[in-house]
């Protein structure tokens, strides 16, 4: 049964979608694989704190070490990067606490950007001066292991020289690696000494080996590639927004809530009401009133603002967020002060630091 | 892992009700929406309604407010679905579905016959 | 409601050819939309969401693309595991609607 009573009839018109969504992220934890991650739960007060990823709940096993308010992966690799959360239950409440960990080398081998200008990889040797292949640029080649999120683009490069000036051909997983080993192909590109993949997928994952060779040798280097995959959640809500705010009678004010969803967020605010002097129904469940929410005649529903206050305005304001998902809901308090109270401060103070005048 | 686990099959009365049943495990039920589809025999796939366990939100088909009442405990991690005034044309499979629609319950299938 | 119109109804396809199914929503949808496959019997299985993703050990000749209103379901080279009806649905905006189905055969 739901946890509360409306006020009023709140039936919501049709929302329009909108074309893109206000996106905050979490807090992002990067860690390479193989590394070792050590995340605080920023809450406070906790009796009991219980830890998810992906929704689904996290123990303790032989690289995940739970201990108090701290989650520890030991060794870290790609298919722990996700959305982690942990609850503090305590005795009248629970309160939960989202980050991102990204497990992951940089998406390319080398700067995605400085294909514009690939000649300093690209050696010309005296004629005379025969030569075996060699690497000219092993920097570009330190990273071996590149765990990507699916949909992005990957380049593995291997800037040689030569003379003469040597060939480059690329294996997958030992074998040599066609066009028509995967939708959409690749692209090499000599001048740069790079294999391009664009929008990578999980059966992209494997050993990508390229070979230079010329008549006087052959060299070759090996990346190993592991495609992440990304999974849709319910909403994230920005720690610590909306935030508490105060002004005085006859003031304005504005509670903001960010919202992170990759799948339509319906955003509500929400106020705890009386009716008939009661705050709460006969069912025992608090009254509440939907104050604002997303939809066609709805500009910038995370942002609430309050216009001349009076004391009733006073209380606490719930932001709720909804997908097809599910929900998240984070709330603050409005305390209106007496205009005597803050002399010559009647302008807003806003609810959060981005808005402050 | 994750399971849905619904009720078994039901023959009912013009008329009467039915309740469904949909056991979550394998995943912490609070945290996700829980849908109701239907799907009549031959015919495609109809959202009946959802429920969002942790504070009993639920949000329902036009097609079907006022006949179906979806509720959750959250103590057995189990969702319902009850639907009133049963007629001939309810006959269907009733799947529930964890809210990211990636787990499916093996589906419940209500015949309504006099 | 969002009214999601699906085509073809059914079609016939031999091992090996690239099927496309099309789903168009009568109001845009952003990318709000999955992609599902149902074979005889069974529930659903969610093979595509956010119009794009492939949900997690989904082979790779699935795919989809498009925003708004018009969305595109590919399988690149149909193998004999594929026969099934495939649905598209739009979770944007309650009710969430289902376009009607597109049964797939092989020749």
């Known amino acids: 049964r739901p946890s509360f009573s409306l006020v009023e009839d709140t039936t919501l018109e049709p929302e329009e979608p909108p074309t893109k969504y206000q996106i905050s992220q979490p807090e992002v934890y990067v860690a390479a694989p193989g590394e070792s991650l050590e995340v605080r739960c920023l809450l406070k007060d906790a009796a009991v704190i219980s830890w998810t990823k992906d929704g689904v709940h996290l123990g303790p096993n032989n690289r995940t070490v739970l201990i108090g308010e701290y989650l520890q992966i030991k060794g870290a690799t790609p298919r722990d990067s996700g959305l982690y959360a942990c609850t503090a239950s305590r005795t009248v409440d629970s309160e939960t606490w989202y980050f991102m960990v990204n497990v992951t080398d940089a998406i390319s081998s080398g700067d995605d950007e400085d294909d514009t200008d690939g000649a300093e990889d690209f050696v010309s040797e005296n004629s005379n001066n025969k030569r075996a292949p060699y690497w000219t640029n092993t920097e570009k080649m330190e990273k071996r292991l590149h765990a990507v999120p699916a949909a992005n683009t990957v380049k593995f490069r291997c800037p040689a020289g030569g003379n003469p000036m040597p060939t480059m051909r690329w294996l997958k997983n030992g074998k040599e690696f066609k066009q028509e080993h995967r939708i959409g192909g690749y692209k090499v590109r000599n001048q740069h000494w790079s294999l391009i993949m664009e929008s990578v997928v999980p059966s992209d994952k494997g050993n990508y080996t390229c070979v230079v060779e010329n008549e006087y040798g052959s060299i070759n280097h090996t990346y190993h590639l592991d495609v992440v995959e990304r999974s849709p959640h319910r909403p994230i809500l920005q720690a610590g927004l909306p935030a508490n705010a105060s002004t005085v009678v006859g003031g304005d004010v504005e509670f903001v809530c960010k919202v992170y969803s990759d799948a339509q967020p319906h955003i509500q605010w929400i106020k705890h009401v009386e009716k008939n002097g009661s705050k709460y129904g006969p069912d025992g469940l608090p009254y509440l009133k939907v104050l604002k929410h997303s939809g066609i005649n709805s500009s910038n529903a995370e942002v609430l603002a309050l216009f001349n206050v009076t004391e009733a305005d006073a209380g606490e304001y719930i932001c709720k967020v909804s997908n097809y998902i599910g929900q998240a809901n984070q709330s603050a308090w409005l305390t209106v002060l007496p205009k005597q109270q803050a002399p010559g401060r009647e302008k807003e103070i806003t609810a959060s630091p981005d808005y402050l005048e | 892992q994750v399971q849905l686990v619904q009720s078994g099959a039901e023959v009912k009365k013009p008329g009467s009700s039915v309740k469904v049943s949909c056991k979550a495990s394998?995943?912490?039920?609070?945290?996700?929406?829980v849908h109701w589809v239907r799907q009549a025999p031959g015919q495609g796939l109809e959202w009946i309604g959802s429920?969002?366990?942790?504070?009993?939100?639920?949000t329902y088909n036009q097609n079907y407010r006022g006949r179906a009442t979806i509720t959750a405990d959250k103590s057995t991690s189990t969702a319902y679905m009850e639907l009133s005034s049963l007629r001939s044309e309810d006959t269907a499979v009733y799947y529930c579905a964890r809210g990211d629609f990636a787990y499916w319950g093996q589906g419940t299938l209500v015949t309504v016959s006099s | 409601d969002i009214q999601m119109t699906q085509s073809p109804s059914s079609l016939s396809a031999s091992v090996g050819d690239r099927v496309t199914i099309t789903c168009k929503g009568s109001n845009g949808v952003s990318n709000d939309i999955a992609w599902y496959q149902q074979k005889p019997g069974k529930a659903p299985k969610l093979l595509i969401y956010s119009a794009s993703y492939r949900y997690s050990g989904v082979p790779s000749r699935f795919s989809g693309s498009g925003s708004g209103t018009d969305f595109t379901f590919t399988i690149s080279s149909l193998q004999p595991e594929d026969i099934a009806t495939y649905y598209c649905?739009?979770?944007?905006?309650?009710?969430?609607?289902f376009g009607q189905g597109t049964k797939l055969e092989i020749k």
């Open positions: 429920i969002y366990p942790d504070n009993g939100d639920s």
């Open positions: 394998g995943y912490i039920f609070t945290s996700y929406n």
């Open positions: 649905q739009q979770h944007s905006t309650t009710p969430y609607t």
